[in-house]
Structure formats: structure tokens, C-alpha cells
């Protein structure tokens, strides 16, 4: 199953997607694509990168971290409605059917009435249930749903959404990402 | 040819306002997240202020929080910085920088412009 | 806050080689830019995610990081490389681009 991201109309949406190099600058190519996950490379291609950079970018989404040393995670700027659905991340591991996918869920809500503060700064989390990670573009609060039961893999994508909890610290160190090679 | 034209620098007293912009050229604008540097006279550089392509979001140093807001106008592809309650601390060469392809922070300075003298004081 | 750390000055002879370190707690897992400025001008990226070079630079430039040092090599160095060296990284806990202090590169 899928894990849910929620943004508001005209926010910015975060998608977290990371895996470990191999050996420093060592890259393999990812694909961001809207939709899941097919048998082979991403639908509906958003971004992608090669083994050295970003080679293409479409207008509002961008690579968010530091992607040279495996964080590929996605911002969606300023979202609509039409941005619900699914997005596909996918680490394209040299070798046959060695690719890592993830599909990432984002629900996109109506924007509030009230106001919301220009940006949100603090990490604050009810664990397990409920955490509100911290924003990334003006007026953005980003909340994940009720967590389903997680596994290493999902845990990939989370760690990074945590990343300025002491916890995504731990779940790095432990090795709860995708390690390549 | 990238290029980056800064433009607004000069003398203003301590508590006065200033608006630096940057005129860029050579490259689509929009898709770059850009940024302003400072350098104070004999010293260091200092990261100042960023923004992304679209213009939606910003990032500001501690030391100039609440004072100085950076802009962009994608189109008439130009970046600016707004400089308000100026201090003598802020005296320095202000350098707009354009981020890296594709990221939303930038990520490094990939071209930058010749900078602006700005000088506060009495 | 996190903090990189240079070397004020570095000397060298020319022919020789140049090493200038950054540190940071645990930088390797960092991408490091390196930017070289002389003296009236304004800075020109010289390394990239710690080790790429643009266009333009020669290959004598080199750089590595890990653990909690970066480290820009300069193979050869010819009088012109005099200048100021500063290291660069993107603080993602606080969403700031910081500098090292900077460093002086002399030929003797």
C-alpha cells in the first residue's frame, strides 16, 4: 500500500524518496513520474536524473535535498487539486528487475479559510499516528494520514520526511534505506 | 551567455532602506533558484537570501530575518532585495547567484554577478 | 548551527600541490562546492558536489570529501591560482547555504 502525503491547494508538496550510494558519487539514475509504478521506468515523467545531475525538469517540481548523495525527494510547488494521486519514485539499479519502486500517495485539500502562518518551522509529531512535518514553501503545513503498518522499504521514504527528528538520524544510522551495491 | 547585472548599492544611513536588483540573461530564469551573497570589506562570504523559480518560497539568513525580503519578477527576469532598518554590519559587496538546474534550493552558485558596493553609515 | 572550518592560509610552491581542507561534523554526508575569488572580482565555481568541474576549470583542480573533511586539491600550481578558496554546503536542517571562513592560497 501506498503511503498518503496531504498538502493544501497552494502549498508546496513534499515527496520523500532517498537510497545510499554505493561509494560517493556512485549514482544511479531515478525517475519521478505521476501515476504508479509500471514494470519498467516511470509514466508521465516529472524529473529524472542520470548518473551525474538533473537531465530533465518540468515546471513546479523539484528535487528538494541533496540528491548527489541519494536524497531524491520531490517539492511540488503551489499544488491544485489536479496534483491528487499517485507519484511513482523509482531507483533505477543497473541489472534486470533490480529497480527499487516506491508509490507515494499525495490527497491534495481544499485550501482553509483561516489563515495560516507564513512557514511552519517546527517539527512536531504525535507518534505513531499522526506527524506534521515541517514546511518547505509559504503557508505550508504538511500532514501524513494514519500510518498503515510500515516495512524497511516504507521506512525509506519516511526517514527523510523526518529527517530533522533525532529519529530520522537513527533510522539512517541503522541502515533503513536502500542501499546500493 | 549567462549573465548577472546587479544594480541599487551606494551610501544610506544607519535605519535607512536600499533595493538591490539583479538583471539576468542568457538562460531561462524561471527554473533556477537564485540568491544573494554578501561579502563584508577583507572579509568572507556570507550566504544572505534565496528564493526558488516560481518565487513561492524563501530562506533568509538570521542576521538579516525581518529586515531584508528578496524577490523576483520572472518576467522581466529579474531578482531583487529589499534592505530595510540597514546597520553599519551590512556594509559589503552584494552578489546575486544563480542555484543549480532542476533543485528547489539551488544548491550551489553556479554563476555570479559582479555585485553592488553597499555602504551604511553616517 | 553547523559549521565549516578552514585554514586561513595555505602556501605553496609553485609546480606543487595544493591541499585546502574543510571541515564539518560528518560532511561526507554533505555535497561540498569549493569557489575560488581573487582579489576586485567577484567568485567562480571551481568544484561541484565535491568532486565535478565545471567547464573552463582545469583538470589540476580536484576535490574529495569524507568522513568530516573536504578536501580541494590543486595539482601544479601556477602563480595564477593565487586567491581566496571557500567551501560551500546547504544546510538542509536550516535551509542555509553556508561558507567556510575561506583560504588564502599564496605562491611562493
Known amino acids: 500500500s501506498e503511503v498518503e502525503y496531504r498538502a493544501e491547494v497552494g502549498q508546496n508538496a513534499y515527496l520523500p524518496c532517498f537510497y545510499t550510494p554505493a561509494a560517493p558519487g556512485n549514482l544511479v539514475p531515478v525517475c519521478w513520474g505521476k501515476g504508479a509504478c509500471p514494470v519498467f521506468e516511470c509514466g508521465n515523467v516529472v524529473l529524472r536524473t542520470d548518473e551525474r545531475d538533473v537531465n530533465y525538469w518540468t515546471s513546479r517540481y523539484w528535487l528538494n535535498g541533496d540528491f548527489r548523495k541519494g536524497d531524491v525527494s520531490l517539492t511540488i510547488e503551489n499544488v491544485t487539486l489536479a496534483d491528487s494521486g499517485i507519484y511513482c519514485c523509482r531507483i533505477q539499479i543497473p541489472g534486470i528487475m533490480n529497480d527499487e519502486k516506491f508509490n507515494l500517495k499525495l490527497v491534495i485539500k481544499p485550501a482553509k479559510v483561516t489563515p495560516a502562518p507564513t512557514r511552519q518551522r517546527d517539527f512536531t509529531a504525535a507518534f505513531p499516528r499522526m506527524l506534521t512535518t515541517r514546511g518547505h514553501g509559504p503557508a505550508e503545513t504538511q500532514t501524513l494520514g494514519s500510518l498503515p503498518d510500515i516495512n524497511l522499504t516504507q521506512i525509506s521514504t519516511l526517514a527523510n520526511e523526518l529527517r530533522d527528528s533525532r529519529l530520522a538520524n537513527d533510522l539512517r544510522d541503522s541502515g533503513a534505506t536502500i542501499r546500493i551495491g | 551567455e549567462v549573465q548577472l547585472l546587479e544594480s541599487g548599492g551606494g551610501l544610506v544611513q544607519p535605519g535607512g532602506s536600499l533595493r538591490l536588483s539583479c538583471a539576468a540573461s542568457?538562460?531561462?530564469?524561471?527554473?533556477?533558484?537564485m540568491s544573494w551573497v554578501r561579502q563584508a570589506p577583507g572579509k568572507g562570504l556570507e550566504w544572505v537570501s534565496a528564493?526558488?523559480?516560481?518565487?513561492?518560497?524563501?530562506y533568509y539568513a538570521d542576521s538579516v530575518k525581518g529586515r531584508f525580503t528578496i524577490s523576483r519578477d520572472n518576467s522581466k527576469n529579474t531578482l531583487y532585495l529589499q534592505m530595510n532598518s540597514l546597520r553599519a554590519e551590512d556594509t559589503a559587496v552584494y552578489y546575486c547567484?544563480?542555484?543549480?538546474?532542476?533543485?528547489?534550493?539551488?544548491?550551489?552558485?553556479?554563476?555570479w554577478g559582479q555585485g553592488t558596493l553597499v555602504t551604511v553609515s553616517s | 548551527s553547523y559549521v565549516l572550518t578552514q585554514p586561513p592560509s595555505v602556501s605553496v610552491a609553485p609546480g606543487k600541490t595544493a591541499r585546502i581542507t574543510c571541515g564539518g561534523d560528518?560532511?561526507?554526508?554533505?555535497?561540498v562546492h569549493w569557489y575560488q575569488q581573487k582579489p576586485g572580482q567577484a567568485p567562480v565555481l571551481v568544484i561541484y558536489?565535491?568532486?565535478d568541474r565545471p567547464s573552463g576549470i582545469p583538470e589540476r583542480f580536484s576535490g574529495s570529501n569524507s568522513g568530516n573533511t573536504a578536501t580541494l586539491t590543486i595539482s601544479r600550481v601556477e602563480a595564477g591560482d593565487e586567491a581566496d578558496y571557500y567551501c560551500q554546503v546547504l544546510d538542509r536542517r536550516s535551509d542555509h547555504f553556508l561558507f567556510g571562513g575561506g583560504t588564502k592560497l599564496t605562491v611562493l
Open positions: 542568457g538562460f531561462t530564469f524561471s527554473s533556477y533558484a
Open positions: 528564493i526558488s523559480g516560481s518565487g513561492g518560497s524563501t
Open positions: 558536489y565535491d568532486s
Open positions: 560528518n560532511i561526507g554526508g554533505k555535497s
Open positions: 547567484a544563480r542555484g543549480s538546474y532542476g533543485t528547489y534550493y539551488g544548491n550551489y552558485f553556479e554563476y
